[in-house]
């Protein structure tokens, strides 16, 4: 495979990763798939420094990240360990609130207007952030 050594047009480089910030909104699953089509993933926040970087770029707008608990436990989309990793939830979050009247609880995490995290209904059309790592060999699968 080939290694990506610089970020694509319209992406922002930071600490050996590339970030792309949407200016439109989609449901979490559609945002997740959008990132996958870019050979990326929804942003995975692993440090306070990365949190501040993303927060600076998105501003005070609800924005999806690559964290969900749709299958039970909270999981990062790239396999980063949730339990031992960085967290920045709002107080009393996540709460899997059922009172929104939309059916079910809240299974997808997003940045809130102050940057701290909240769980919300995955169908809400929020902005999103894609991330891909530099120097990661892109796996071009063999032809069948």
């Amino acid at each position: 495979g080939s290694e990506r050594t610089c970020c694509p047009v319209n992406w922002v480089e930071h600490e050996r990763s590339c970030y792309w910030f949407s200016r439109s909104g989609k449901a979490w699953a559609d945002a997740d798939n959008y990132c996958r089509l870019e050979d990326a993933h929804l942003v995975v926040v692993t440090s306070w420094e990365e949190q501040k970087f993303v927060q600076h770029h998105i501003g005070p707008v609800n924005t999806w990240m690559g964290l969900h608990d749709q299958n039970g436990p909270w999981k990062w989309v790239d396999g980063t360990d949730y339990e031992t990793g960085f967290k920045n939830w709002r107080p009393e979050q996540p709460d899997d609130w059922y009172g929104h009247g939309l059916g079910g609880g809240e299974d997808c995490a997003h940045f809130t207007d102050d940057g701290r995290w909240n769980d919300d209904v995955c169908q809400r059309p929020y902005r999103w952030v894609c991330e891909t790592e530099l120097d990661k060999a892109s796996q071009e699968p063999p032809l069948l």
Partner: antibody, heavy 122, light 108 residues
Framework: EVQLLESGGGLVQPGGSLRLSCAAS????????MSWVRQAPGKGLEWVSV????????FYADSVKGRFTISRENSKNTLYLQMSSLRAEDTAVYYC???????????????WGQGTLVTVSS | DIQMTQSPSSLSASIGDRVTITCRAS??????LNWYQQKPGKAPKFLIY???SLHSGVPPRFSGSGSGTDFTLTISSLQPEDFAIYYC??????????FGQGTKVEIK
């Protein structure tokens, strides 16, 4: 100039297989997700499958899932669609299309090939 | 899947006429709406994205509007080369993209 040229269509019996190819030129092929869209005779357009630029992520319409496989060879600027267990309802012109996108998050099919006809009949 | 419904399915118009085609989505798709033109025996041609943004090289007589579930494609002054089938397509559901059934614009 962006160009997409499909090939590999033809007449095949139900249950048979066929592999379509799409040769791309005029742009950095590996930077774009590529898709197949089909059109049955006298009918509208139906999205079939899409593949990310590296080939690492693939998606399929429910109507072809498990029967069709999309792939690409970036060194040859070529997209493929391997079709198996073909049915009469797969008869269509198959178009290769580039997934364009702009900075806000909107995407679209900005360039299309001329299409290749697949006829499934006994 | 999101269903896209166009109306009318066909229309007859004269050169110079103002033509409007509508497209309705089965659920809110914000502005994730594209328009394509297809002539007989040819591949579709990309016209408009994000409901109202013209693709490069598309004549300004074409315009799009709408958001949510209701959208329109307008040709301000129909030209001979505009007789074709027009399709809308939603790009909200990535990548479960769906098209309208098409609207045929014929010569009166």
């Amino acid at each position: 100039e962006v160009q997409l040229l499909e090939s590999g269509g033809g007449l095949v019996q139900p249950g048979g297989s066929l592999r379509l190819s799409c040769a791309a030129s005029g742009f950095t092929f590996s930077s774009y997700a590529m898709s197949w869209v089909r059109q049955a005779p006298g009918k509208g357009l139906e999205w079939v499958s899409v593949l990310s630029g590296s080939g690492g992520s693939t998606f399929y319409a429910d109507s072809v899932k498990g029967r069709f496989t999309i792939s690409r060879e970036n060194s040859k600027n070529t997209l493929y669609l391997q079709m198996s267990s073909l049915r009469a309802e797969d008869t269509a012109v198959y178009y290769c299309a580039r997934r364009g996108r702009e900075y806000s998050g909107y995407d679209y099919f900005d360039y299309w090939g001329q299409g290749t006809l697949v006829t499934v009949s006994s | 899947d999101i269903q896209m419904t166009q109306s009318p399915s066909s229309l007859s118009a004269s050169i110079g006429d103002r033509v409007t085609i509508t497209c309705r989505a089965s659920q809110n798709i914000s502005s994730y709406l594209n328009w394509y033109q297809q002539k007989p025996g040819k591949a579709p041609k990309f016209l408009i994205y994000a409901a109202s943004s013209l693709h490069s090289g598309v004549p300004p007589r074409f315009s799009g509007s709408g958001s949510g579930t209701d959208f329109t494609l307008t040709i301000s002054s129909l030209q001979p080369e505009d007789f074709a089938i027009y399709y809308c397509q939603q790009s909200y559901r990535t990548p479960l993209w769906t098209f309208g059934q098409g609207t045929k614009v014929e010569i009166k």
